[in-house]
């Protein structure tokens, strides 16, 4: 019988008392085979973290700063359940730390030196740790003691709770630096008042502070937010302009064998029976003998943290950067305006080989990081382990939802002004063998399908989106008798046709022979009835253009396209017989790396792009014998996006809507995790 006990860690006598009450009340409402609570008392949160890591306890609720500590080795804990605030309809699990300024003040984030600052309090998250952590490497040396460095960075501050004797400049704007509401500039509202009164130039608060203090839009319009990319935005655009997105209060558990499903089962049942307004006898979110015991008194309920989410992703790149800077206190030697090497994310073995070759040829401008799947690469770019990669539109969507931005687009047509003219896109098509003459778009049910990969544009999002509109359910593995759609669940019929050996079967990378455009076409040639690819795939792999044994004798004339009206056309008539127009593949990165990735890639393509004539003796960025490694092999150049610099603008409203409709069929664990952070 599996042990269904969750050992909750308490950090005080009062918490232990509440925990015992929690245990007893749960016993009275949960069947004997359901989850139960046991209580473990420790002296501090750090002791609780160590106890969970050592398997002496299972769960504890922590503030964001402690979630970071819990994540660090050797603890390796992960977030499993989040408290939420507000209503069930609009649950808030995060708040945003922001920098508020007056509209007419004219400076940006990188011009804060010499300004006057208003803080909620020394050592507090939004008011001190996050802004000072992000500014850390701009502070004058020596950076220790930190208060002295901050005092020398700003021309005056109000940082309540600071030592006014040792650091008088930190109390210059609020004499005495009082650490309670007796100081009119203490806390969120106090820091905002410090700005409003004209004492300071910038207030470090949270996103709701301005709405809690100013009821009129006309008054709020006198203020703006400073964004990390050195722009400003209106105060209601905090989701796109903040210093960090911070989780409010989170239950953590072990990453391996951490009972996360059991913890969720327990807390979900607990909120049903003892949540807000549920029971007079015991209330989960109430602390008669103290404040915020076990859980925050202000919480309204719990939400399950998606399993794909580790602590780094949950806390977010900006928060982790700020806290790491403060804790470790390390900065690059002398900060220069020069770009650091771009860390390119390479998928599996084949891409890594090409990337290493690129790295050597780039003389240190490019470094390589490996991952097994596209989603793993996106996650690495999010958390700073990697910087960039080129993605199919379907993954540009996921990357965008995860906060990344497109920076350059692959162009596939030769033109005089390639780098300045991003193309409208390519065509997603359905290819069949000419010999299967009875096959049309309308009778694909029960046939064998070949896809580039789950979540990709031409191979999945477009055809499956169209199919979903027809069949109104997500059971595509029942619609086709079998197929190869790399990235599907291994036991799915959509992995049955795949050719990868052992663990590589159906993997969404080049270790699966039927992965990508060329792989999906090969699947059609060897086993399938229909392949969902791009309009260039057939000509690129027929007529001797692909020398691989399976392709070298293929003839374009032996294949036809399925049109949406139920007819068929020759391959060259793709412009009048396609499923949809697909956005070109694009390079994505984090917002903070956008300028450097743009600059370095443009240099790199001038050195190794289409202008290189002999690829046998020289490195060619856009060549890999039809394997589309790192970039599509038919890329002519990487083009500027001009104003299409967000994933929505780049992909276009129609495609975003189409992928959004398919979201209900999504198996993307990363998309689930990212929409948890930003619904």
């Amino acid at each position: 019988v599996p042990d269904k006990t969750v050992r909750w860690c308490a950090v005080s006598e009062h918490e232990a008392t509440k925990c015992q009450s929690f245990r007893d009340h749960m016993k009275s409402v949960i069947p004997s085979d359901g989850p139960s609570v046991a209580c473990v008392k420790k002296a501090s949160y750090l002791d609780c973290i160590r106890a969970i890591a050592a398997n002496e306890a299972d769960a504890v609720t922590l503030d964001a700063g402690l979630v970071y500590d819990a994540y660090l080795a050797p603890n390796n804990l992960k977030p499993v359940v989040a408290e939420f605030y507000g209503s069930k309809e609009d649950p808030q699990t995060f708040y945003y730390a922001v920098a508020v300024v007056k509209k007419d003040s004219g400076f940006q984030m990188n011009q804060l030196r010499g300004k006057k600052s208003c803080h909620t309090g020394l050592g507090r998250s939004a008011g001190w740790n996050i802004p000072i952590g992000l500014l850390y490497c701009d502070l004058p040396e020596p950076r220790k003691p930190l208060e002295k460095a901050v005092a020398n960075f700003f021309s005056g501050s109000c940082a309540p709770c600071a030592d006014g004797t040792d650091f008088p400049q930190l109390c210059q704007l609020c004499p005495g630096c009082g650490c309670s509401t007796l100081n009119q500039y203490f806390g969120y509202s106090g820091a905002f008042k410090c700005l409003k009164d004209g004492a300071g130039d910038v207030a470090f608060v949270k996103h709701s502070t301005i709405f809690e203090n100013l009821a009129n839009k006309a008054d709020r319009d006198q203020y703006e937010l400073l964004c990390l990319d050195n722009t400003r935005k209106p105060v209601d655009e905090y989701k796109d302009c903040h210093l960090a997105q911070v989780p409010s209060h989170t239950v953590v558990a072990r990453s391996m064998g951490g009972k996360e499903d059991l913890i969720w089962e327990l807390l979900n049942q607990a909120q049903e029976h003892f949540g807000k307004d549920k029971s007079k006898e015991f209330q989960l979110f109430s602390s008669p003998h103290g404040k915020d015991l076990l859980f925050k008194d202000s919480a309204h309920g719990f939400l399950k943290v998606p399993p794909r989410m580790d602590a780094k992703m949950y806390l977010g790149y900006e928060y982790v950067t700020a806290i790491r800077n403060l804790r470790e206190g390390t900065c690059p030697e002398a900060p220069t305006d020069e770009c650091k090497p771009v860390k390119w994310c390479a998928l599996s073995h084949h891409e890594r080989l090409k990337c290493d070759e690129w790295s050597v040829n780039s003389v240190g401008k490019i470094e390589c990081v490996s991952a097994e799947t596209t989603e793993d690469c996106i996650a690495k770019i999010m958390n700073g382990e990697a910087d960039a990669m080129s993605l199919d539109g379907g993954f540009v969507y996921i990357a965008g939802k995860c906060g990344l931005v497109p920076v350059l687009a692959e162009n596939y047509n030769k033109s005089d002004n390639c780098e300045d003219t991003p193309e409208a896109g390519y065509f997603a098509i359905a290819v069949v063998k000419k010999s299967a003459s009875d096959l049309t778009w309308d009778n694909l049910k029960g046939k064998k399908s070949c896809h580039t990969a789950v979540g990709r544009t031409a191979g999945w999002n477009i055809p499956m989106g169209l199919l979903y509109n027809k069949i109104n359910h997500c059971r595509f593995d029942e619609f086709f008798s079998e197929g190869c759609a790399p990235g599907s669940k291994k036991d799915s019929s959509l992995c049955k046709l795949c050719m990868g050996s052992g663990l590589n079967l159906c993997e969404p990378n080049n270790k699966e022979g039927y992965y990508g455009y060329t792989g999906a076409f090969r699947c059609l040639v060897e086993k399938g009835d229909v392949a969902f690819v791009k309009h260039q795939t057939v000509p690129q792999n027929t007529g001797g253009k692909n020398p691989d044994p399976w392709a070298k004798n293929l003839n374009e004339k032996d294949y036809e396209l399925l049109c949406l009206d139920g007819t068929r056309k020759p391959v060259e008539e793709y412009a009048n017989c396609h499923l949809a127009r697909a956005p070109n593949h694009a390079v994505v990165t984090r917002k903070d790396k956008e300028a450097c990735v743009h600059k370095i890639l443009r240099q790199q393509q001038h050195l190794f792009g289409s202008n290189v004539t002999d690829c046998s003796g020289n490195f060619c960025l856009f060549r890999s014998e039809t394997k589309d490694l790192l970039f599509r092999d038919d890329t002519v150049c990487l083009a500027k996006l001009h104003d299409r610099n967000t994933y929505e603008k780049y992909l276009g409203e129609e495609y975003v809507k189409a992928v959004g409709n398919l979201r209900k069929c999504s198996t993307s664990s990363l998309l689930e995790a990212c929409t948890f952070r930003r619904p």
């Epitope: 605030y85 709701s208 709405f211 009821a215 009129n216 807000k276 309204h300």
Partner: nanobody
Framework: DVQLVESGGGSVQAGGSLRLSCAAS????????MAWFRQAPGKEREGVAA???????TYTDSVKGRFTISRDVAKNILYLQMSSLKPEDTAMYYC?????????????????FGQGTQVTVSS
């Protein structure tokens, strides 16, 4: 979630006064913005006045100078003092609350409403 219960409505002559009250079951993040709405027969519900967590207020033009919104945070009660009442103020008055993720004057974002209290102003 938060429960809101209004009281204080009634019938009054034009030029008279009324004070509406609204008791909130809990004081929480989702009551940081509170407002009064009204709905006259055959018309859409409209925002009348709102108050932010720390007391800043906003009014729709038609009631400025006549109505005052206030709140007692300790008791979780919202008030609307209405004076110089006019027949066109006749309506069902609702108390509402929302989280401070947008302006308290953004009436379309209010998510929780009470059952309402009737105010009738006769000439």
């Amino acid at each position: 979630d938060v429960q809101l219960v209004e009281s204080g409505g009634g019938s009054v002559q034009a030029g008279g006064s009324l004070r509406l009250s609204c008791a909130a079951s809990i004081y929480t993040y989702s009551t940081a913005c509170m407002a009064w709405f009204r709905q006259a027969p055959g018309k859409e519900r409209e925002g009348v006045a709102a108050i932010a967590r720390y007391g800043d207020t906003t009014y729709t033009d038609s009631v400025k100078g006549r109505f005052t919104i206030s709140r007692d945070v300790a008791k979780n009660i919202l008030y609307l003092q209405m004076s110089s009442l006019k027949p066109e103020d006749t309506a069902m008055y609702y108390c509402a609350s929302k989280s401070p993720n947008s302006g308290c004057d953004e009436y379309a974002h209010y998510e929780t409403f009470g059952q309402g209290t009737q105010v009738t102003v006769s000439s």
